[in-house]
């Protein structure tokens, strides 16, 4: 299996809610021997491998951010340590799972890793991340909207419907 | 921050049976994949079992197999180790730790110590 | 089994000098290699995580380095509270493994 980053980079204004999303892709196995921990963090970009530093989030660790699941289960963080940080992570059927930040600082900006370890009976691990950037922006040239480029071009994608404003 | 202490350790002849208890503090143990590792006295660390947060599965080190039997209560938060059929060379320290996937033990009690003589 | 073998088995360093510490294993690894400080009468406490990175509260006088089969850890300058039992362990394949440890001294 392949862990694939739908949108590598996330460009915000502050005050905004955003999900950074990454997607389970490839032959999942779901079997009763086989089970996923998937998890995130922040990192940077290091020399030798990107996402090989585990760096909290908003000072929730990894294994605070941990969903636990078979294949394609669905499973949400239901800890109240994560939303009291106003953060989520959730998982669907579908093989995508997600880290939702609410009310995004500057401080929030740097690289990001979703962490996927395929958990078999009798094996050795198998360990898959992928990354993507959060550019969280202020003042006058900071977008309206979250701004997201996908992956594969730097064709940049407007995010509006799903994410809104944080409001106090 | 979660705390893991262990008990139940003791002297026991060979043949004997104990049974530790590694008590975790905190609301988060049913997501804890913990290992069982021992140290004999002046010597090094060895792995001894694992177990996941769900319970399933469960490995032995081979010169535990057939005699330790690893076993978890959620409710309880609390983690034991059943040993049977004990030898002078499994007189340790035991340390229960955490072992999450793709990650290190990096969480562990202080330990408790199992003596094995006649 | 992975098998990892530990050198020198014995350090004797000063306060203030450099220590290198070894760790190869009998097959790859990959880069899956945790170092370990175990002081008297303590539990070990996690100190290097996927062969290179430190583990949260590390100094930065400690590195290390490798992948594969050979690993290495270095304390830039040792400080009194560095004088202790140091292993590798390795998590690429069952059974866990851990090296047989280094015992820092103090010379």
């Known amino acids: 299996f392949k862990v694939a980053t739908p949108y590598s980079l996330y460009v915000c204004p502050e005050g905004q809610n955003v999900t950074l999303t990454c997607r389970l892709l490839g032959p999942v196995d779901k079997g009763h021997d086989v089970t996923f921990y998937k998890t995130w963090y922040r990192s940077s970009r290091g020399e030798v491998q990107t996402c090989s530093e585990r760096r909290p989030i908003r000072n929730l660790t990894f294994q605070d951010l941990h969903l636990h699941h078979g294949g394609h289960q669905a499973a949400n963080t239901s800890h109240d340590l994560a939303q009291r940080h106003g953060l989520e992570s959730a998982s669907d059927h579908h093989g995508n799972f997600s880290i939702t930040m609410r009310n995004l600082t500057l401080l929030d900006s740097g690289l990001y890793c979703c962490l996927v370890v395929e958990i078999r009976h009798h094996h050795s691990e198998h360990r898959v991340h992928g990354a993507m950037e959060l550019q969280v922006q202020t003042g006058k040239d900071a977008p309206s909207n979250c701004v997201v480029y996908p992956s594969s071009s730097q064709e940049s994608e407007n995010i509006t419907a799903h994410h809104h404003h944080h409001h106090h | 921050q979660v705390q893991l202490v262990e008990s139940g350790g003791g002297l026991v002849k060979p043949g004997g049976s104990l049974r530790l208890s590694c008590a975790a503090s905190g609301e988060t143990f049913s997501d804890y994949y913990m290992s069982w590792i021992r140290q004999a006295p002046g010597k090094g660390l060895e792995w001894v079992s694992y177990?996941?947060?769900?319970?399933?599965?469960?490995y032995y080190a081979d010169s535990v197999k057939g005699r330790f039997t690893i076993s978890r209560d959620n409710a309880k938060n609390s983690l034991y180790l059943q040993m049977n059929s004990l030898r002078a060379e499994d007189t340790a320290v035991y340390y229960c730790a955490r072992d999450l996937p793709g990650w290190y033990f990096d969480l562990w009690g202080r330990g408790t110590l199992v003596t094995v003589s006649s | 089994e992975i098998v990892l073998t530990q050198s020198p088995a014995t350090l004797s360093l000063s306060p203030g000098e450099r220590a290198t510490l070894s760790c190869r294993a009998s097959q790859s690894v990959s880069s899956y290699l945790a170092w370990y400080q175990q002081k008297p009468g303590q539990a070990p406490r996690l100190l290097i995580y996927?062969?290179?990175n430190r583990a949260t509260g590390i100094p930065a006088r400690f590195s290390a380095s490798g992948s594969g089969t050979d690993f290495t850890l270095t304390i830039s300058s040792l400080e009194p509270e560095d004088f202790a039992v140091y292993y590798c362990q390795q998590r690429n394949n069952w059974p866990r493994t851990f090296g047989q440890g280094t015992k820092v001294e103090i010379k």
């Open positions: 177990i996941s947060n769900s319970g399933s599965p469960i």
């Open positions: 996927d062969a290179s």
